[in-house]
Interface confidence: low
């Protein structure tokens, strides 16, 4: 991997802005074009602004013009974006425009988000992306290829990055158990610029909490953890940045049963009358010698399933109450 | 609250144009969302066409690029449709449909009653 | 374009039941949401975002899923549950072919 990235790195350093990529079929072509096609003046180069910022939900336009050597080129050609990286990366749109034509036919417009806005003829390859989700923030490269008699390709290398930006939204908030029959909770939100997250509840003001850096792959996730909820009530999450805050809250009831040794007593006294009901059972069957196999069930009997996991945990930790909770 | 309401022919005859009106009450549509058209045909399919942005922007389905056309009129708080060159399997009941975007995805949160369009021959 | 394939076409249960719509998608998306259309009447929003419950839909609701596969779930069937149910993948527009529910 770290061979990859150096190499990575030293043909970045060596490839000029747009890289001049052919085949070795298209380079003997060209060279025979050239003096046919091309103007002393003019070169192949892409312009692209280096970012493009637009709110989620709305639509942005990518801008990129090419210049070209080859002079009044009329034949058959294609536009392509590709997303993450050059040529590589996977392409989001693609037309296809015939000799002569002014029209390009799309071939691929990833979910019907992505329309065509410039002129490939006129060299405008801009592009306007619908719709826009936190997901579609990446950097995009245009590209043009003509396959007439001139074959040529040309590729911006380093692209424009979309910036998407989008307040805060709160997509999961929880409790959790955790270790010393206490509880923590748990809020993510996304957003961008990365939203700030805050606790508050009952003996916590307004805690910022422990905040894990964004998740690998989810850049626009942040996580805060309150680790130990120490009160019954409303503990609020409070998400925000530069455009707007969202909040959302979870409650914590636990039943406050007896103290922990008149608990364990019950318990014990529980467990000691079930187990004479057993001796007795099995007392009175074997008085009547009867002869099959005891009928005993393989599992033990259980209570019936609780649809409350913290119902769950109760029963497993008398001393660990149960809570309740809400989603947003 | 919100409300939508499709008015517009129940008849349109074959290779004409197939216009219909959504009045939208409670809610501006240049204040946000996005103004969609649904059809669902005979056997319960349902299409989505297009849609008006709150901006005036559109966007519609690739398989009815051609013919269809979204318009609005603001000062009514209306939108429209208009398809153009009908054919029979253009039969269907036609909804028009607020959208909710909340960063992550879109989803029809407001559904006008229908008006059921029949193209004859 | 991605299809959505929803299975069964028609189911039939019993009330009481829990019951399980499927709904797989041609390739991964991202959530998936689900309308409820009874008889005579306009598709509603049922449950966006793959598992939230939209507004003054009852708790018996449920969505889960991730990828290429989603489902909803009605954990104890109603009458009034007699429906078609259709799922929705919003990026490229498409609906499910839908399931009609009967109530036996």
């Known amino acids: 991997m770290e061979k990859s990235i150096w190499l990575l790195a030293c043909l970045a350093w060596v490839l000029p802005t747009g890289s001049f990529v052919r085949t070795k079929i298209d380079t003997t072509e060209n060279l025979l074009n050239t003096e046919v096609h091309s103007s002393p003046a003019q070169r192949w180069s892409m312009q692209v602004p280096p970012e493009v910022s637009a709110e989620a939900g709305d639509a942005a336009v990518l801008p990129c013009t090419f210049t070209h050597p080859h002079r009044h080129y009329d034949g058959p050609l294609t536009a392509i974006w590709r997303a993450g990286e050059p040529y590589a990366g996977p392409q989001v749109f693609r037309c296809a425009a015939a000799r002569g034509s002014e029209l390009c036919q799309t071939a691929l417009s990833l979910h019907g988000r992505f329309r065509l806005l410039g002129n490939p003829r006129r060299n405008d390859l801009s592009l306007r992306v619908e719709r826009l989700a936190l997901a579609d923030d990446r950097r995009y490269f245009c590209r043009v290829e003509f396959a007439g008699d001139v074959h040529d390709r040309y590729e911006s290398r380093h692209g424009v990055r979309l910036h998407v930006t989008a307040a805060p939204r709160i997509v999961n908030i929880s409790v959790l158990p955790s270790p010393a029959h206490a509880f923590r909770a748990l809020c993510t939100a996304e957003g961008e610029p990365p939203p700030a997250l805050a606790w508050s509840g009952p003996a916590l003001g307004n805690s910022l909490a422990a905040v894990r850096s964004p998740r690998e792959g989810h850049g626009h996730l942040v996580t805060a953890e309150l680790p130990a909820l120490t009160h019954d009530g409303r503990y609020t999450c409070t998400a925000a940045n530069s455009l707007g805050r969202s909040e959302a809250s979870v409650y914590l009831f636990r039943f406050h049963g007896a103290s922990g040794a008149s608990t364990v007593a019950l318990l014990l006294g529980a467990l000691g009358f079930k187990a004479l009901l057993l001796l007795g059972v099995l007392a009175a069957r074997a008085a009547r010698r009867r002869p099959e196999h005891l009928d005993t069930p393989d599992t033990p009997p259980r209570s019936q399933a609780q649809e409350s996991n913290y119902e769950n945990l109760s029963q497993m930790n008398p001393r660990s109450p149960p809570a309740t909770m809400c989603s947003p | 609250d919100v409300q939508l309401q499709e008015s517009g022919p129940g008849l349109v005859k074959f290779s004409q144009s197939l216009s219909l009106t959504c009045s939208v009450t409670?809610?501006?549509?240049?204040?946000?969302?996005?103004w969609n058209w649904i059809r669902q045909f005979p056997g319960n399919k349902l299409e989505w066409m297009g849609y008006?942005?709150?901006?005036?922007?559109?966007n519609y389905n690739p398989s009815l690029k051609n013919r269809i056309s979204i318009t609005r009129d603001t000062s009514k708080n209306q939108f429209f449709l208009k398809l153009n060159s009908v054919i029979t399997e253009d039969t269907a009941t036609y909804y028009c449909?607020?959208?909710?975007?909340?960063?992550?995805?879109?989803?029809?949160?407001?559904w006008g009653t229908g008006t059921t369009v029949t193209v004859s021959s | 374009q991605i299809v959505l394939t929803q299975s069964p076409a028609i189911m039939s249960a019993s009330l009481g039941e829990e019951i399980t719509l499927i709904c797989s998608a041609s390739?991964?998306?991202?959530?998936m949401h689900w309308y409820q259309q009874k008889s005579g009447t306009s598709p509603k929003l049922l449950i966006y975002?793959?598992?939230n419950l939209a507004s003054g839909v009852p708790s018996r609701f449920s969505g889960s899923g991730s990828g290429t596969f989603y489902s909803l779930t009605i954990s104890s069937v109603e009458a009034e549950d007699a429906a078609d149910y259709y799922c929705?993948?919003?990026?490229?527009?498409?609906f499910g072919g839908g399931t009609q529910l009967e109530i036996k």
């Open positions: 449909v607020r959208e909710i975007y909340d960063g992550s995805s879109g989803y029809f949160d407001v």
């Open positions: 409670g809610y501006s549509i240049t204040s946000g969302y996005y």
């Open positions: 008006i942005r709150h901006d005036g922007s559109n």
């Open positions: 390739s991964s998306v991202s959530y």
């Open positions: 975002r793959t598992s």
């Open positions: 929705h993948q919003w990026s490229s527009w498409t």
